[in-house]
Structures are given as C-alpha cells and as structure tokens.
C-alpha cells in the first residue's frame, strides 16, 4: 500500500531529478546573456526559458492533485505548496510571451542605455562605468545634474510604456494565483501558514515595515539634517537649510546609498581615513584579491571555500569593449553545484564590501544545496540579502581593516574615529532605509491601483519629498519613469528585501557577536575567526526554505519577528553625537522648496470665466501649445533683443506643480543643457514681449491667462476705442 504522502514524495523525487537539468540549461543561457548581451543570446535564453517554463507549468498542474491538508510531512507539504504556485505560467501563451519580451527589453535598455554629449554625439557614456563614475565622484553640481537627468531622459522614458504594460501583466498573473495584486504576490514570500505560533501574514509585513520605519525616522532625520549642512558647504547657494536634499547630490545615480558622501561629511577629517580605497589602490589590489579576501573571511568562521568552478566561471571585472554585460552585481546559483558571481568590480572599499555581500549569497546557496530543489532558497528574501551584510559589518570595522593591512598598524581607535566609522556606516545603512521603504511603498500602491498611471511621477516625487526628504532637481512629467531608472525596478526584483535585511542583519549580528564572545559595543564587533558564530549561522543557512523564517529567526536570535532595536543600539553613539551637532539646525524638511523654485513663474488660467460655454479642456495638448508658445517667445526675445539665435524648444520649458483648477509653475532651461536655467527676469521680458501672441493662441486675455508677477503687457491696460 502507498499513502498519498508517499505518492507525493515519489512525484517530487521525479520532479527534483528532471528540474535540476532543465533549470541548469535555462540558468546557463541566462548567464550567457547577462555576461554578453547579444541578439543570439537573447534568443537562446528565451528558448531555454520556454522549455523550463513549460516543464514547470506541467508539473504545477499535476501537483494540484495532491491536497495539502492530507500531507503531514512539512518538507513534502512545503514543496507541493511551492509547486502549486503557478507564477507566470497562469498567463495565456501570448501574454506570457509578451511579458517575457517586456522583461528582456527592459533589461537590455537598462544595461545598454547610453547618454551622449549634446555637443559631441559620438561621446557617449553607459551607466557603468561612465555615469556611475560621475555620480560617485563629481562635485560639480551641473555635471551631476546632466548625468542624473540624461539617464532618466534617455533610459527612463524608453522604459515608461514597457513598465505600464508590465504592471498590467504582472497584476493579472498575481490575481490568477489568488493574490490581490503583484505587490501582494511579492509579500507572499514572507507568508507562513499552518505552523502553530509561527504564522506570519502578508498584511503583517506591511504593518511591521511601517512601525519599524517610525522607529528609525528620528535617527534618519538627524542624519539628513547633518548631511544637508555639509552639502550646503559643498554646494553653496544650491541647498535650502530647511528643505529637501536635491536628488542628484546623494552619492550615486539614485541616492540609494550615501556612502560616497563620506568625504564631504567626515566628522573628524584630521583622523586617518577609514575609507580604505586609497590603501587598496596603493597596495595594487585587484578584483581577484578583493574576492579572495572575502573568501578568507567566510572560511575564517568555518564556512566553505568557493568552488573551483566559481573561480573559473565567474565574471568579476567589466569586459569593457569586448562585449556588453549587465554590470549590476549578482550572485548565481545555476544548480548542479555551479555557483558564480557577475560583477564589474572596481578597486574601492565600497566594492570590497559588495564582494562580501555577493559572496554571502553564494554561501547561502552552497549551504542549502542539499535541500530538495524547491526548498533551495532563503527562508525569506530578506534573509538572503542579510548574510553578506553581516560579514560586511565585521569587514568594515577598523579592527578588521587593520588585520588585513588596509589600515596602518598604528591606527588608534578613539571617540573621533568611532564617530567617523559610525557616520560612514550610517550613510550606507541608515541613509538607504527611507529610499527603500518609499520605493516599495510606491510600487505596492501602483500595483494596488492606488496611483493612476497619469500620476505616477507626480506621486513618486511627492512621496520622495515627504518620506525621504529628497527633491527632484528638475520637474519630471508623466513621460518619465524615474523608478525604472533603478536596476531592481526595470529588472523585476522586489525591493522590500533590502529593508527587512537591514533589520535582520543587526539582529543576526547581535546574536553572532554573543556566540563569538564579543564584549563591548555592537559596532566594534568583528566575528572573523569565530567558528562558533559561523556554526550558528550555518545551522540556519543549511535549512534554506525548509522551515518557516519565523522559526529560523528564532533559532538564531531568540525572537520570531523583525526588530529595529539592535540597529538603533549599534548607531546609538552616533545618534547622540548627531543630536548635539544639529542643535542649532532645523531637523526635518519642508516639502515646498525646490531647487528651481526661485526661477519659476506661476501661471493661472481661467477658461470658464473667460470662455463660458465655449471653454475647452486643458489637457496635454494645451500644455504642449503653452510650452511651445513660451519657447517661441524665448526665441523672439533672444533674437530681437540680444541678437542671438537660440533654438528654444517646448522641451526646454519645464512645468511643475500642475493643479487641476489650472495653475502651474514653469521655468526655462537652455537647449540641450538642463543645468543652465534662464534667469526668471529674462523669461519675464520674453513673455511680455510676446504676450499678445500667447494670449491669442489660447483665446484668452491678460486676466484669464495670468502670469503672476509679470505686468500685463507693455501697452496700456485698456486700449481706448479707435475713432
């Protein structure tokens, strides 16, 4: 006799055996595309992906025969649960193909997108290394603005229609899988059902994120105020002492990690530099050395070496002009014991820590390789992200850097070096939390249908100002898709994992430091060489997804839930110091200020009162005409008054704060140069000169088309009748 459970086991054994092979073929084809973006490799990836999808769909269909309520064995139950999830395979064939095409196209646009110099179209930059270099190192406000705006204009705008379609198809897929929407589907990764005392709902994740964010806010607000004061020194007259931070000044293309602001914000600059980039360069480190050092760290806590195949097959440097690759760092578990990292490593401290992060993924992958195919994953997505981060917390400590020769042997730790270190850590770790929370909150709202697509950008920047305290340096209308200018958005990765991982990593760090018998503050703990800490971690890693994450967390840290306390404890000395630094500064931000506010002109339009029943609707076409009319006025003014032929176009007239009762602000930039804002006084003169032409275009007059602060016209306000 054979029970249903035994039959399910037989079914799953057969599945595991066949899945291994097909998944490997698909992964390999995907790796080939990611390391060498060609049309042929896209085709191969799609073909292998189609085979894998078809197999998965068939197996998922067969798995429905096994009722979960009759399965007692948790391992069998979890595998069936995973397999009964249909994922994208619930879509019709044509929709499934379309979704695949959209995802591939978005990925290709992102990784091959170029920005060219308007004065020399042959001179072009990719994101990596070109634009990222500017955003990491440049202190030129206008150069940064050019890179920031060009990336979003070139790449974001191309992604916009694709992203709109992606949202519709992913929602359809999620609903067919019995989720409310795609955001809900993503949150399903944290769901735990039917395990007494360890259950966790998708709604609970939202609650936990919201209430932990409230607890983090005071620390972030003080970091924000301190950074703002330092940016005011670096960019005099560009920053408001009570306003948001301009989005293009924050250390990378997205303001995601503020790490590169360290040199501008270092509290005690006379102390030896704990950003060891220069030491790495001086000592001739290369990508191989960086990863070998990361490996040494893992091995020192008793975790395994990387495989021979890892070193042979990984792509650890940018292939440059040889071929185009996806340069965003990723860790790959292709199956069959084949583990790889793809990263365009640069010799910087930042990439030294990123190497630990990526190798953390591989350690997790290797640890659960013995689990059945369907349970080879992190207990939840945040766990996977946390592993390498735990190692980075130790690897970044002055103690550890000293031990590997990147800080001088006579480096002395004191209160000042401690604050320098904690500030550097906070720029990376605390600075990113509101960014992460706000991005995912926006996507959740989009998937839920709470933000109509004609308000995506409007809401994005409203939320960015309110939650993150960051403002757009130039306004963006609904032709842009700023979220998709980030890898994770255009490449279909959930993002809340980077929030949850940050909380978990400090919970884990606290527990592992106890295991390593560390004494003293948490921020000084370096777990390297502690096999006790390594063993404690490994016991969790090897479980993969075979146990609920709430249970796995409890096994390591003694609590079932994410908790922000350890993170706040870690940064406590810095928080105290920041409060003292900020005692004469405004902490928080006004969302009203923008970098372009001073040069903006407000317009009010009264169609109803001017035209009565003949009033037309103010829409995108009318706005296009308005911007064209102002561009015309600018051309006329520069030609007639300044004897300069400057070809202003409608795209140089930048509109913000459009209100439905028709008011908005606008300012004008020089053609092909977003950072060259034409002074408001010049624009006012141009408007006055062409006022009647602009009025006529809209069948309005000086009162119903009102430019606030501009005298109606150069002529008398009321023409006497001609006799």
């Amino acid at each position: 006799q054979s029970t249903i459970e035994e039959q399910a086991k037989t079914f799953l054994d057969k599945f595991n055996h066949e899945a291994e092979d097909l998944f490997y073929q698909s992964s390999l084809a995907s790796w080939n595309y990611n390391t060498n973006i060609t049309e042929e490799n896209v085709q191969n990836m799609n073909n292998a992906g189609d085979k894998w999808s078809a197999f998965l769909k068939e197996q998922s269909t067969l798995a429905q025969m096994y009722p979960l309520q009759e399965i007692q064995n948790l391992t069998v139950k979890l595998q069936l649960q995973a397999l009964q999830q249909n994922g994208s395979s619930v879509l019709s064939e044509d929709k499934s193909k379309r979704l695949n095409t959209i995802l591939n196209t978005m990925s290709t646009i992102y990784s091959t997108g170029k920005v060219c110099n308007p004065d020399n179209p042959q001179e072009c930059l990719l994101l990596e290394p070109g634009l990222n270099e500017i955003m990491a190192n440049s202190l030129d406000y206008n150069e940064r603005l050019w890179a920031w705006e060009s990336w979003r204009s070139e790449v974001g705008k191309q992604l916009r229609p694709l992203y709109e379609e992606y949202v519709v198809l992913k929602n359809e897929m999620a609903r067919a899988n019995h989720y409310e929407d795609y955001g809900d589907y993503w949150r399903g990764d944290y769901e735990v059902n039917g395990v007494d005392g360890y259950d966790y709902s998708r709604g609970q994740l939202i609650e936990d994120v919201e209430h932990t964010f409230e607890e983090i806010k005071p620390l972030y607000e003080h970091l924000h105020a301190y950074v703002r004061a330092k940016l005011m020194n670096a960019y005099p007259s560009y920053i408001s002492p009570i306003g948001c931070l301009p989005a293009h000044l924050l250390g990378d293309m997205w303001g995601r990690f503020w790490t590169n602001l360290y040199s501008l914000t270092v509290p005690f600059g006379q102390k030896p530099n704990i950003d060891v980039t220069d030491a790495m360069v001086d000592q001739a480190w290369d990508a191989q050395r960086i990863f070998k050092e990361a490996e040494k760290f893992f091995v020192s806590v008793g975790l395994p070496n990387m495989t021979q195949g890892f070193w042979e097959n990984s792509m650890l440097t940018d292939p440059g002009n040889v071929q185009k690759a996806v340069c965003h760092p990723t860790a790959w578990d292709l199956g069959k014991g084949d583990f790889r990292i793809l990263m365009c490593t640069k010799v910087t401290m930042d990439d030294f820590l990123t190497a630990h992060h990526e190798m953390g993924h591989i350690q997790y992958d290797m640890a659960y390789a013995a689990q059945p195919f369907l349970l080879r994953n992190g207990a939840n997505e945040g766990f996977h992200e946390a592993v390498g981060e735990i190692m980075s917390l130790s690897a970044a400590t002055p103690k550890h850097l000293k031990s590997i020769g990147l800080l001088s042997p006579d480096f002395q730790e004191d209160n000042e070096t401690e604050i320098n270190f904690l500030l550097k850590q906070a720029l990376t770790i605390v600075g990113t939390l509101p960014f992460t929370y706000m991005l995912e909150k926006w996507r959740w709202m989009v998937f839920k249908g709470e933000i109509p697509k004609d308000q995506w950008m409007k809401k994005w920047w409203e939320m960015k100002r309110e939650i993150v305290g960051v403002v757009e340096p130039v306004p963006h209308d609904e032709t842009y898709c700023d979220p998709a200018s980030l890898f994770h958005v255009s490449n279909d990765y959930s993002f809340i994992r980077y929030y949850t991982r940050t909380l978990y990593q400090f919970q884990f760090q606290e527990a592992l430091c106890q295991a390593a018998k560390h004494e003293g503050p948490l921020h000084k703990c370096d777990i390297s060489n502690s096999t006790e800490a390594g063993q404690k971690l490994f016991n969790m890693l090897r479980l993969g997804k075979s146990e609920p994450w709430t249970l796995a967390l409890e096994n390591v840290v003694g609590a079932k839930n994410m908790n922000v306390r350890p993170l706040l404890n870690y940064f406590e000395p810095l928080f105290t110091w920041l409060k003292d630094q900020n005692k004469n500064s405004f902490v928080g931000w006004s969302t009203d200020w923008s970098p372009y506010a001073d040069q903006s002109i407000k317009v009010r339009i009264s169609l109803k009162s001017a035209l009565g029943d003949k009033a037309y609707e103010w829409n995108d076409n009318e706005m296009y005409l308005f911007r064209s009319s102002v561009a015309y006025a600018m051309r006329q003014y520069f030609l007639k008054v300044k004897n300069q032929m400057i070809l202003f176009g409608e795209e140089d007239v930048r509109v913000a704060n459009l209100k439905p009762r028709i008011s908005f602000n606008f300012f004008v930039t020089a053609p092909k140069n977003v950072s060259d804002i034409i002074p408001r006084t010049e624009v006012e003169k141009a408007i006055r000169m062409s006022r009647s032409r602009i009025n006529d275009a809209f069948r309005l007059n000086d009162n119903s088309l009102e430019f606030l602060g501009i005298q109606p016209t150069l002529g008398p306000p009321n023409q006497p009748p001609v006799s």
């Epitope: 039959q7 079914f11 309520q69």
Partner: nanobody
C-alpha cells in the same frame, strides 16, 4: 502499470450536463488519487479536480467549483466527472491521470464541445 481510458465526451448545449468516465486497469494503490485535466484548443493543459479512490478530500479548480463533481467507484475501478451548467469555455479535451503514475502518459482524452 496503470492504464487509463477516458469516455463520455460529446456535443452539448450551454447550460447542459455531461458525465465523463475514466476506467483504470492495473491499479495497485487503494489510496491513490484520480485527477481530471483539460486542454482547450491553443491553451495549456489545466487542472480540473481530483478525488481519492478511498474518499478523502476532493479538490476543484476555481473555474469549475459548484458546477462539476468528481467521484470514484472503487469496485468498478472508475472515476467520474459530472459536469453541470456547462459553458462554451468548458470546451476542451478532457483527460484523467493518477498519482500512482507520477508522470502520466496522457491518453487520447475525450472531447467535450459546448455550443448552441
């Protein structure tokens, strides 16, 4: 090994009923489950429902809940799919499979056409 033969298909008007049978020979497990699947023209094969020879839990796809009923007659080694309130979108080739054979070799199936 188990051999399965489906029968009972045909043309039926919307709102009508039909009963399909799946005869199993070579059965060895009293505790196995019988599943019904269907494949509409140009679509992927989809799960309809499943029942255990020994009773137990019966599961259905959302699209057929409340209209279709699956049963099994242990003594006759036959499983049934009673389909009521049929709709044009139920038009498909219907197949049966068993958990005794984790990787079914799909038979000919039986064609059900719902049309006025």
């Amino acid at each position: 090994e188990v051999q399965l033969v489906e029968s009972g298909g045909g043309l039926v008007q919307p709102g009508g009923s039909l009963r399909l049978s799946c005869a199993a020979s070579g059965r060895t497990f009293s505790d196995a489950r019988m599943g019904w699947f269907r494949q509409a023209p140009g679509k992927e094969r989809e799960f309809v429902g499943a029942v255990s020879w020994s009773g137990g839990t019966t599961v259905y796809a959302d699209s057929v809940k409340g209209r279709f009923t699956i049963s099994a007659d242990n003594s006759k080694n036959t499983a049934y799919l009673q389909m009521n309130s049929l709709k044009p979108e139920d038009t498909a080739v219907y197949y049966c499979a068993t958990t005794e054979d984790p990787y079914p070799r799909w038979g000919q199936g039986t064609l059900v056409t719902v049309s006025s």
